[in-house]
């Protein structure tokens, strides 16, 4: 039974990882630190050209399980590294693209660069 | 041997457009990337940006976006670099240079263009 | 973008010493860094990549070291020809930045 004047709503489960975010900011980052209750990631990716490009930030918990397994999606070359060890822990965070497969050259030498 | 040469000095006004050539020879243009980087008087190095030599795709470092376009010209070998509304803070030396597969360091270099208002 | 703190801006040092320059990275770059020497007059040089490599025909003199944020480029002896200008070069990620520079001089 609950004490008088308990509430009976869940208390929000507070935003206790601070993470570095590039690319990936929301509007009140202040410092490129961004706040969540989940996962701090660092990806790199490969844009139309064919540059690696990192982006880093905050994952909620929800959906970040999912989002931190990396995946690997046909014809796009990318790689995600998470982490919830220590605020700001993602800087430390070195994903790699995937290595190029035998059949990624039949565009030509560096199309899929 | 492999080279990279780049074509002369340039003397432009404001408002002026300015086109720098990058001859390549002893390889195939089309199996590296073509970069182009920057070089202000006394300054340090800036990279603008490269050219996908097979796709033809360029891409832009946020600060030359807009005035600044990289073409090709595959049968002469040849990469460009084009700076459109020439400004004073363009002056500079521009180089182009080669980085292989996948690798984003650059093992061969042009000759450079300076370009001086 | 990254930024890559490069130091000292400046070495005067007599031709047989032993020179180091360090760059540090914002963020962790793994081993994808790169060197390059720029001769007055002159365009830059590739003499180090992957934070450790030699280039083809650069002299063992040269050598780099590092990984993630703190990396090191050494000259084991110095010579009158090695006056130059050095730079450092982060190449993980787009826009690839370099650092601002170390001049040597020759006593």
């Known amino acids: 039974k609950k004490e008088d004047g308990e509430s009976t709503a869940p208390t929000p489960r507070p935003k206790v990882l601070r993470c570095k975010c590039h690319h990936h900011c929301p509007e009140d980052s202040v410092n490129n630190i961004c706040s969540t209750d989940g996962y701090c990631f660092t990806m790199i990716e490969e844009d139309d050209s064919g540059l690696p490009v990192v982006t880093s930030g905050c994952l909620g918990l929800e959906g970040s399980d999912f989002q931190c397994r990396d995946t690997p999606i046909p014809h796009q070359r990318r790689s995600i590294e998470c982490c919830t060890e220590r605020n700001e822990c993602n800087k430390d965070l070195h994903p790699t693209l995937p290595p190029l497969k035998n059949r990624d050259f039949v565009d030509g030498p560096i199309h899929h660069r | 041997q492999i080279q990279l040469v780049q074509s002369g000095p340039e003397l432009k006004k404001p408002g002026e457009t300015v086109k720098i050539s990058c001859k390549a020879s002893?390889?195939?243009?089309?199996?590296?990337?073509m970069n182009w980087v920057k070089q202000a008087p006394g300054k340090g190095l800036k990279w603008m940006g490269w050219i996908n030599t097979y796709s033809g795709v360029p891409a832009y470092a946020d600060d030359f976006k807009g005035r600044f376009a990289f073409s090709l010209e595959t049968s002469a070998s040849t990469a460009y670099l084009q700076i459109n509304n020439f400004k004073n803070e363009d002056t500079a030396t521009y180089f182009c240079?080669?980085?292989?597969?996948?690798?984003?360091?650059?093992?061969?270099w042009g000759t450079g263009t300076t370009v001086s208002s | 973008s990254f930024v890559m703190t490069q130091t000292p801006k400046f070495l005067l040092v007599s031709a047989g010493d032993r020179v180091t320059i360090t760059c540090k990275a914002s963020?962790?770059?793994?081993?994808?860094v790169a060197w390059y020497q720029q001769k007055p007059g002159q365009s830059p040089k590739l003499l180090i990549y992957?934070?450790?490599n030699r280039y083809t025909g650069v002299p063992d003199r040269f050598t780099g070291s590092g990984y993630g944020t703190d990396f090191t480029f050494t000259i084991s002896t110095v010579q009158a020809e090695d006056l130059a200008v050095y730079f450092c070069q982060q190449d993980y990620s787009s826009p690839f930045t370099f650092g601002s520079g170390t001049k040597l001089e020759i006593k």
């Open positions: 240079a080669r980085s292989e597969l996948r690798n984003w360091y650059f093992d061969v």
């Open positions: 963020q962790n770059m793994g081993h994808n």
């Open positions: 992957y934070a450790s």
């Open positions: 002893g390889y195939t243009l089309t199996t590296y990337g």
